[in-house]
Interface confidence: low
Amino acid sequence: GITIPRNPGCPNSEDKNFPRTVMVNLNIHNRNTNTNPKRSSDYYNRSTSPWNLHRNEDPERYPSVIWEAKCRHLGCINADGNVDYHMNSVPIQQEILVLRREPPHCPNSFRLEKILVSVGCTCVTPIVHHVA
Amino acid sequence: GITIPRNPGCPNSEDKNFPRTVMVNLNIHNRNTNTNPKRSSDYYNRSTSPWNLHRNEDPERYPSVIWEAKCRHLGCINADGNVDYHMNSVPIQQEILVLRREPPHCPNSFRLEKILVSVGCTCVTPIVHHVA
């Protein structure tokens, strides 16, 4: 029978019907011109699940610098400013696309790579496992 | 700084500086093989600043499907399960790279594009402006 093609949002690297090599113009078009440049820059401090931003640098990757969020506490900050361990600070992770130089050190040849980054933290109710 | 020698097996490039147009292999390498596949998938419901995920689809973009977080409430969920408007649910936004077909409808020609996406929500203390 005929296989229904996979949704193009989930490309299959083994799929023969997906182009292997393409030309990419690195002159970035930024579609965020109307957004507030400060955006969520102060949320990391004001959140009930605050986080620190760590610089992850890799010259073989484009972009070479990515900022990773690390939650400051296991718990969340309560109204008194104390850490409440009945709640959990957890990282919100997202898969993003980056370009990886391939072969290594090549100036104009890349492979798409999917990496998981932590963007910030949120406060969640813990999953409680009751012992029978 | 130390210059990394160019790999002799690299494709030829006319641009001696940072390349404008590069070759990209779309056979995605996924570096997240050791991560928990569930990841943060249930955080959107368990968070004190819960969010819904909206599908953003654009066939001229790669990836063509991106999920956008929209915070459910203006306030945050308190210990009683009610919305507390003394706190604010805010989206955590991240700039990500996508590929945009250029010229439009071309099968193997893209431009890098930076777009702002909301990944999830976090609960923050509001900024209170005191009137003098």
Epitope: I4, N7, P8, M23 | V65, P103, H105, C106, S109
Partner: antibody
Framework: EVQLVESGGGLVQPGGSLRLSCAAS????????IHWVRQAPGKGLEWVGW????????NYADSVKGRFTISADTSKNTAYLQMNSLRAEDTAVYYC????PDMWAMDYWGQ | DIQMTQSPSSLSASVGDRVTITCRAS??????VAWYQQKPGKAPKLLIY???FLYSGVPSRFSGSGSGTDFTLTISSLQPEDFATYYC?????????FGQGTKVEIK
């Protein structure tokens, strides 16, 4: 199974109108482009136009511009070709065809 | 509009023959070329896309090559079911345009 089923063809007088339908099934309609391509008796293939059901964007061949309109109803997964001011040279078999964005060729055609 | 010129317009060949059809674009179309097979009374079927990628389910005796302005469809060993008309098509710019077709007949 991916399917495109055309309907609505018939005999019409010069200057008349006709609406063709292309019912799609077995795939995400909004993730594709739908093309209309025609073939006059004993002749080759001629592209008529396309639509992105996702955005509603359309594009037409010069030979039909202003006379033909392509539309889509995403709730019905159906594309339409409205043909007005028909001429003798529009006599042809009309095919609808699907184009997935990550291939840019027409991989499924109606019959 | 970009013109796609196919040659020959028709050819006679025998089962087992190697058949080559060429397509020339009036301007550079990178590798944005597809090849289709059409039998009488039937809709076209995709064989090759992006100049050289074999579409799934298409026998490996079909191959495509080329970039820029010159493209080739090759059938390495002609089979009885391959007697049909073949079209090239560019999708580099709007409007997409087809070649005039090459009819492959039994010798």
């Amino acid at each position: 199974e991916v399917q495109l089923v055309e309907s609505g063809g018939g005999l019409v007088q010069p200057g008349g109108s006709l609406r063709l339908s292309c019912a799609a099934s077995g795939f995400t309609f909004t993730s594709t482009a739908i093309h209309w391509v025609r073939q006059a008796p004993g002749k080759g293939l001629e592209w008529v136009g396309w639509i992105y059901p996702y955005s509603g964007n359309t594009n037409y061949a010069d030979s039909v511009k202003g006379r033909f309109t392509i539309s889509a109803d995403t709730s019905k997964n159906t594309a339409y070709l409205q043909m007005n001011s028909l001429r003798a040279e529009d006599t042809a078999v009309y095919y609808c065809a699907r184009q997935v964005p990550d291939m840019w060729a027409m991989d499924y055609w109606g019959q | 509009d970009i013109q796609m010129t196919q040659s020959p317009s028709s050819l006679s060949a025998s089962v087992g023959d190697r058949v080559t059809i060429t397509c020339r674009a009036s301007q550079d179309v990178s590798t944005a070329v597809a090849w289709y097979q059409q039998k009488p009374g039937k809709a076209p079927k995709l064989l090759i896309y992006s100049a050289s990628f074999l579409y799934s389910g298409v026998p490996s005796r079909f191959s495509g090559s080329g970039s820029g302005t010159d493209f080739t469809l090759t059938i390495s060993s002609l089979q009885p079911e391959d007697f049909a008309t073949y079209y090239c098509q560019q999708s580099y710019t709007t409007p997409p345009t087809f070649g005039q077709g090459t009819k492959v007949e039994i010798k």
